[in-house]
């Protein structure tokens, strides 16, 4: 479902030609400098060109726009607003373009924008209104269906004095504009936690990717409203155990498939319920691959092969018996 290029021929625009006519109003379907265009495929590619801003003279026919591998730095309000508007633009890929700031209303006036990829940009400043476009408590619905935000965490020294998770979630929830979102990818963002209200306000999600983060627990996260959720990727996190409430919620979702590989499962007495559930459920994909990381004596044991006798907790000694 990602934008793909067609075999149709692409026309390139030489930079000297563009500068020669820059004083003239742009032709409606010319190809911007440093870009390749295929009207037949309705695709414009401005890839690895070190562009510092979005071309102003994008052809009106564009449906798939690749602006990857550039140096855009900032995406201002109305970055894609044109007269006439880019009414057909459905898929926009801005990955790896060194964006560190996306301002409020950056994607306004794109009525058909279904798929947006901002991955691999160090987003130190993502406006809460980047996707909703306004600070109203309830905004006009965004047309976005797929939002790809993998590896958008900036280096630690470039982060603002606020929670990165909170910044991203604020942008996802603002104005309830993203209620139609069906795919959300948030992989590789060093998330330590998932704010409890985020999923409740994204009821149309079919696919959620939270892999390769640092999630330790899902205790306060509710999946109950995600009736349509089909895939939940939690591989490569820091999960130690899933508790009863989470297990019951996941089991209650009719279409869900959960991916839990490569988490440091702690196989002590708190794991008993999860092991029992794993043995019965069809929810978890590749459940036979899940192994214990702790305690040391249990390392590499397969969760499905454990029984209650294996899952013990060291007794907590009263203070008088504890040794230093």
């Amino acid at each position: 479902s990602s934008p793909t290029s067609s075999a149709s021929s692409f026309s390139s625009s030489a930079p000297f030609l563009a500068s020669a006519v820059s004083a003239q109003p742009p032709l409606p379907d010319q190809c911007p400098a440093l870009c390749e265009c295929s009207e037949a495929a309705r695709t414009v590619k401005c890839v690895n060109r070190n562009l510092t801003e979005v071309p102003t003279d994008l052809p009106a026919y564009v449906r798939n726009l690749f602006l990857t591998g550039n140096q855009l730095a900032v995406l201002p309000a109305g970055a894609f607003a044109r007269r006439p508007p880019l009414a057909e633009l459905a898929a926009l890929n801005l990955s790896g373009s060194r964006l560190d700031e996306v301002r409020a209303g950056a994607f306004e006036h794109l009525p058909s924008l279904r798929q947006l990829d901002l991955s691999h940009n160090p987003l130190a400043d993502l406006s809460p209104f980047a996707f909703s476009g306004s600070n109203a408590s309830v905004s006009a619905p965004s047309p976005l269906v797929e939002l790809i935000l993998n590896h958008i965490v900036p280096p630690e020294d470039e982060r603002q004095n606020r929670s990165f998770e909170g910044m991203v979630v604020a942008a996802l929830l603002a104005g309830r504009a993203l209620q139609g979102l069906r795919r959300l990818e948030l992989a590789s963002n060093h998330f330590l936690y998932l704010p409890r209200d985020v999923l409740a306000q994204l009821p149309s999600l079919r696919h959620l990717d939270l892999s390769n983060n640092s999630l330790v627990s899902l205790t306060y996260v509710s999946f109950r409203n995600l009736t349509h959720l089909e895939s939940l990727h939690l591989e490569d996190n820091a999960l130690k155990v899933l508790h009863n409430g989470t297990l019951a919620e996941l089991q209650g979702l009719p279409h869900i498939r959960v991916f839990l590989d490569n988490n440091p499962w702690v196989c002590d007495c708190h794991m008993a319920d999860m092991v029992t559930w794993l043995k019965e459920t069809e929810v978890v994909q590749g459940k036979d691959r899940l192994t214990c990381a702790y305690p040391e004596k249990m390392r590499n044991r397969v969760l499905l092969e454990l029984n209650s006798a294996d899952l013990d907790c060291d007794p907590i000694l009263p203070p008088s018996l504890q040794t230093s």
Partner: antibody, heavy 117, light 113 residues
């Protein structure tokens, strides 16, 4: 990527038939799959659908007589049809549902089922 | 049961002229825009033209467009070509607490005048 139906043929009223749909180039278990039928010179009629994890949903007229199942190891979808009637005579198509939108984005060529004595 | 009504049943349009087909659902489709249009030529399976009410499927010419929301939808062919002669079907997707339901319209046969 493609799907191919098989198993159609002539069956007597009251009889049973199992149609198969073999998927190539993609994993059947990763998609919702559906069966649709079309009587000669008539319109398309939705039969039912199987979700990725195996939940099934049917048109009201198909409940009880028609059963959709899947064998992931064989990458094959099935339609079990029981108590067949003359009005079940049709071309039966299997179709894949998009992973994001609830639309049929890949169709087989169909297999003809004729119910007649 | 959900009923999808297509109109007209058949349509004859001159080459180069606009063709318009309507589809009305007895209930709102899921998320108000889960409506697809298919083209079927004799002896062939249906081919997806438009999904999500207005999104053109890959490889479909620009002369096809879709519009509408909720219960009322339209397929438009801006300039009819000879290869557009076919039967066109709308299809809605529906969700309720009891699960999913799909329904097709009765079809519209498009011919050249």
């Amino acid at each position: 990527q493609s799907v191919e139906e098989s198993g159609g043929g002539l069956v007597q009223p009251g009889g049973s038939l199992r149609l198969s749909c073999a998927a190539s180039g993609f994993s059947l278990s990763s998609y919702w799959m559906s069966w649709v039928r079309q009587a000669c010179g008539k319109g398309l009629e939705w039969i039912g659908i199987i979700a990725g994890r195996g939940s099934t949903y049917y048109a009201s007229w198909a409940k009880g007589r028609f059963t959709i199942s899947r064998d992931n190891s064989k990458n094959t979808l099935y339609l079990q049809m029981n108590s067949l009637r003359a009005e079940d005579t049709a071309v039966y198509y299997c179709a894949r549902v998009s992973s994001i939108y609830y639309t049929f984005n890949l169709w087989g060529q169909g297999t003809l089922v004729t119910v007649s004595s | 049961d959900i009923v999808m009504t297509q109109s007209p049943d058949s349509l004859a349009v001159s080459l180069g002229e606009r063709a318009t087909i309507n589809c009305q659902s007895s209930q709102s489709v899921y998320s108000n825009n889960e409506l697809s249009w298919y083209q079927q030529k004799p002896g062939q399976p249906p081919k997806l033209l438009i999904y999500y009410a207005s999104t053109l499927a890959s490889g479909v010419p620009d002369r096809f467009s879709g519009s509408g929301s909720g219960t009322d939808f339209t397929l438009t062919i801006s300039s009819l070509q000879a290869e557009d002669v076919a039967v066109y079907y709308c299809q809605g997707s529906y969700y309720s607490g009891s699960g999913w339901y799909y329904a097709f319209g009765g079809g519209t046969k498009l011919e050249i005048k």
